[in-house]
Interface confidence: low
């Protein structure tokens, strides 16, 4: 053979990614690797990820004699071993008046009355709790609700008998019943007084409630 | 409140192995790294592996590999490791550290290997 | 592996002064997501090495503020503003940027 034709093992260099070749016999030669590759050639980047320490669902992302440890969003740091501080970061994670508690791997809600749900954005339905009586309707509110009465009765959960219905205000005046107790108020026209608006006035004093 | 209690003194002849063990309590063992570090008298310390509780996956300082296994019972979340083939310059404490913040965070009491003749 | 080198070897200070103790990196101690993980241990005798700063500058739950850190890429420094006789110790700087973790070779600080 010509001399053109004579194999040199390292001119030029099988040995790749940085590696450093050695002839060791006519026809051997050895890669000299640098930290991170591996193979004959230096041809493999070794995979530093089998026995990482990404923790808490961290994803491994190899690289040259390293790696990285990408985080899912609720932790941080080199491992993913930090929690983060969501409501340091998300300073209206809590709606309507609702306090931020930090948890490890995550963050709670304490939400004020009348709200629920993880971000306190949900009103709790009051009326599925009231006492209202039976025929009359609840109206939910945010941390109370009301009964509307059917005609008849009356108090603030509908229990009690409305004494309106008996029409005991006279002489054209308004008849209203008191919520509490369920009793009348008569609101006696111009020139008429008393519980029932009965009675005539002698001075010009119009207007006058009376409650019974 | 994190504690890592470790096994008690040992004497050892040169060639033998020990096993070293590191009860965990007081947070959740599979979410931290458990690190080995061991220390010569009148010396710095030394890192020299790790275990994930949750996989089992180890690695070690380069220095102790083929000498050094570390296993897990995560049953008892206690952590272990074991050196073979002792020599007199094994002759270290061995401690136990729990991960965090890329760091060594808590630490064992620490457990003495003694290798002699 | 990375070297870590502190100076000085030991430290004597009156109770009050305040200590500094060098630690210096073979290279930068940055990470590729952005953190520094330089950390700072205290070790007395017959104890483990107890977490001081980590990152640089953050204090560890329940270490008092007269312990600060500082520096960055391949140089850090911790501080005892006012040296108290439990402060008497050897102190440790740790880097866990690069594999495999290595420590420094301690400070001894004594009282003057």
């Known amino acids: 053979a010509g001399s053109d034709s004579l194999y040199v093992p390292c001119a030029p260099s099988p040995c790749v990614n940085g590696g450093t070749c050695r002839q060791t016999g006519d026809f051997t030669f050895e890669c000299n690797c640098l930290p991170g590759f591996e193979g004959s050639t230096c041809e493999r980047n070794i995979d530093d990820c089998p026995n990482h320490r990404c923790q808490n669902g961290g994803v491994c992302v190899d690289g040259v004699n390293t790696y990285n440890c990408r985080c899912p969003p609720q932790w941080t740091g080199q491992f993913c071993t930090e929690d983060v501080d969501e409501c340091l970061l998300q300073p209206n994670a809590c709606q309507n008046g609702g306090t931020c508690a930090n948890r490890n791997g995550g963050y709670g809600c304490v939400c004020v009355n009348g709200w629920s749900g993880d971000d306190c954005s949900e009103n709790i339905d009051d009326c599925a709790f009231a006492s209202c009586t039976p025929g009359s309707t609840c109206i939910d509110r945010v941390a109370s609700f009301s009964c509307m009465c059917p005609e008849g009765k009356a108090g603030l959960l509908c229990h009690l008998d409305d004494a309106c219905i008996s029409n005991p205000c006279h002489k054209g005046a308004l008849c209203d019943t008191n919520p509490l107790n369920g009793q009348y108020i008569c609101t006696c026209p111009q020139g008429y007084k008393g519980a029932d608006c009965t009675e005539d006035v002698d001075e010009g004093n119009s207007h006058h409630h009376h409650h019974h | 409140e994190v504690q890592l209690v470790q096994s008690g003194a040992e004497v050892k002849k040169p060639g033998a192995s020990v096993k070293v063990s590191c009860k965990a309590s007081?947070?959740?063992?599979?979410?931290?790294?458990i690190h080995w570090v061991r220390q010569a008298p009148g010396q710095g310390p030394e890192w020299t592996g790790y275990i994930i509780p949750g996989s089992g996956g180890t690695k070690f300082n380069e220095k102790f590999k083929g000498r050094a296994t570390s296993t897990v019972d995560t049953s008892s979340t206690t952590a272990y490791m074991e050196l073979s083939r002792l020599r007199s310059d094994d002759t270290v404490v061995y401690y136990c550290?729990?991960?965090?913040?890329?760091?060594?965070?808590?630490w064992g009491q620490g457990t003495l290997v003694t290798v002699s003749s | 592996d990375i070297v870590m080198t502190q100076s000085p070897d030991s430290l004597a200070v009156s109770l009050g002064e305040r200590a500094t103790i060098n630690c210096r990196s073979s290279?930068?101690?940055?990470?590729?997501?952005?953190?520094?993980?330089l950390h700072w241990y205290q070790q007395k005798p017959g104890q483990p090495p107890k977490l001081l700063i980590y990152?640089?500058?953050n204090r560890f739950s329940g270490v008092p503020d007269r312990f600060s850190g500082s520096g960055s890429g391949t140089d850090f420094t911790l501080t005892i503003s006012s040296l108290q006789a439990e402060d008497v110790a050897v102190y440790y700087c740790l880097q866990s940027t690069h594999f495999p973790d290595t420590f420094g070779g301690g400070t001894k600080v004594e009282i003057k």
């Open positions: 990152r640089i500058s």
């Open positions: 290279q930068s101690l940055v990470h590729s997501d952005g953190n520094t993980y």
């Open positions: 007081g947070y959740t063992f599979s979410n931290y790294v």
């Open positions: 550290a729990r991960d965090g913040a890329g760091s060594f965070t808590y």
